[in-house]
C-alpha cells in the first residue's frame, strides 16, 4: 500500500477542481485581487496564496469548493516546506557555485525576461 | 543607441564571468554557504543572494571579479523589481484564476517535485 501520494498528483487534481468551480468563484463581480504582471510564478508564491486567502474568505463554502481550498492549502504547505529547504544545508563554495551557475542557466533559458 | 542592455545579456555575461573566476572563488577552503537542496531556484532567490554576499565579503576584490559581483547585484535588482510586480495590479477574480491556473500548470509540468 502506498504511504504517500506525490504532490504532482495533488496539483493535477487541484487543476481539475479549479476548472469545475470557476463559475462559482467568479460570481463576485466587485472583488479585486492582486495579479502578478509577469510569468515568473515562483517569485510570487506569497502573493498568489494571499490572493487565494482573499478569494476563500469571499466564497460561499460548502460541498466540493471546500476541497479546492483544502488542496490549495496543502500545496502552500508543500511550497513553504520547499522554501525552508533553501537555506538548511551549508556546503563548500564549490557546491554553492554549481547551484548559482544552474540558477543563472535556468534564468538564461527558462525565465520570461523583459528588459 | 540602446538605452539599456537587456537582462538576458547580463545573465549570459555573468555566466561567462562565473566560469572564468571559479578558481579564485573556491580558494577559501573553510567557507561554508547555505545551498538549497532542491532545484526550484526561484523559490530561493533570497538565500542565493545572501550566499553571494557572503562570498563577496570573503573574496579578494580587484580586476574583473568585481565585474562579476556588480553583475550579480544588477541581477538581484532585476529580481527585486520582478518581486515588486507580484502584487502591484489588482484585477478581477477571472484574471486571478487565469494566473493561478497557469501557476499550477507550470508546477505540474516544470517544477521538480519530490514526494
Amino acid at each position: 500500500i502506498p504511504t504517500e501520494i506525490p504532490t504532482s498528483a495533488l496539483v493535477k487534481e487541484t487543476l481539475a477542481l479549479l476548472s469545475t468551480h470557476r463559475t462559482l468563484l467568479i460570481a463576485n463581480e466587485t472583488l479585486r485581487i492582486p495579479v502578478p504582471v509577469h510569468k515568473n510564478h515562483q517569485l510570487c508564491t506569497e502573493e498568489i496564496f494571499q490572493g487565494i486567502g482573499t478569494l476563500e474568505s469571499q466564497t460561499v463554502q460548502g460541498g466540493t469548493v471546500e476541497r479546492l481550498f483544502k488542496n490549495l492549502s496543502l500545496i502552500k504547505k508543500y511550497i513553504d516546506g520547499q522554501k525552508k529547504k533553501c537555506g538548511e544545508e551549508r556546503r563548500r563554495v564549490n557546491q554553492f557555485l554549481d547551484y548559482l551557475q544552474e540558477f543563472l542557466g535556468v534564468m538564461n533559458t527558462e525565465w520570461i525576461i523583459e528588459s | 543607441i540602446p538605452t539599456e542592455i537587456p537582462t538576458s545579456a547580463l545573465v549570459k555575461e555573468t555566466l561567462a564571468l562565473l566560469s572564468t573566476h571559479r578558481t579564485l572563488l573556491i580558494a577559501n577552503e573553510t567557507l561554508r554557504i547555505p545551498v538549497p537542496v532542491h532545484k526550484n531556484h526561484q523559490l530561493c532567490t533570497e538565500e542565493i543572494f545572501q550566499g553571494i554576499g557572503t562570498l563577496e565579503s570573503q573574496t579578494v576584490q580587484g580586476g574583473t571579479v568585481e565585474r562579476l559581483f556588480k553583475n550579480l547585484s544588477l541581477i538581484k535588482k532585476y529580481i527585486d523589481g520582478q518581486k515588486k510586480k507580484c502584487g502591484e495590479e489588482r484585477r478581477r477574480v477571472n484574471q486571478f484564476l487565469d494566473y493561478l491556473q497557469e501557476f499550477l500548470g507550470v508546477m505540474n509540468t516544470e517544477w521538480i517535485i519530490e514526494s
Partner: nanobody, 119 residues
Framework: QVQLQESGGGLVQPGGSLRLSCAAS????????MSWVRQAPGKGLEWVSS????????YYEDSVKGRFTISRDNANNTLYLQMNSLKSEDTALYHC????????????WGQGTQVTVSS
C-alpha cells in the same frame, strides 16, 4: 477500523472495458470525497478521478477524460470506476482513496486491484 477493498481488475484487450468497485467500511462513507489513484509499473502514484460526497461533482485526469466514469452508491458504501476504451498505458494497480483528516491528502487507501491492458 477504516477499510477500503477494491475489486474488478483483470486482463483486458486494448479498447475493452472494466468496472472497478471499492467497498468501504469503518467510516461514514456518504460524508467523504472519494478518489481513484493508480500506480503503473516503475512509476509514481497518479491521481485518476474524484467524486464529491453526494456524487454531484466528478473530476478526471486529462488522459482518462471521456473514457472513465466515477460514481458512488452511498446506500451501499461503494465507489465505482467504469473504464472504457482501455489503452496499454492504463495498465496499473488501481487504489481507491479518501482522506479523513483535514490536514492531509489521501490518508487512507486500499490494497488495490490490478488492471492489465494487453493484446
Amino acid at each position: 477500523q477504516v477499510q477500503l477493498q477494491e475489486s474488478g481488475g483483470g486482463l483486458v484487450q486494448p479498447g475493452g472495458s472494466l468496472r472497478l468497485s471499492c467497498a468501504a467500511s469503518g467510516f461514514t462513507f456518504s460524508n467523504y470525497y472519494m478518489s481513484w489513484v493508480r500506480q503503473a509499473p516503475g512509476k509514481g502514484l497518479e491521481w485518476v478521478s474524484s467524486i464529491s460526497s453526494d456524487g454531484s461533482n466528478t473530476y478526471y485526469e486529462d488522459s482518462v477524460k471521456g473514457r472513465f466514469t466515477i460514481s458512488r452508491d452511498n446506500a451501499n458504501n461503494t465507489l465505482y470506476l467504469q473504464m472504457n476504451s482501455l489503452k496499454s498505458e492504463d495498465t496499473a494497480l488501481y487504489h481507491c482513496a479518501t482522506d479523513l483528516y483535514d490536514d492531509s491528502w489521501y490518508d487512507h487507501w486500499g490494497q488495490g486491484t490490478q488492471v492489465t491492458v494487453s493484446s
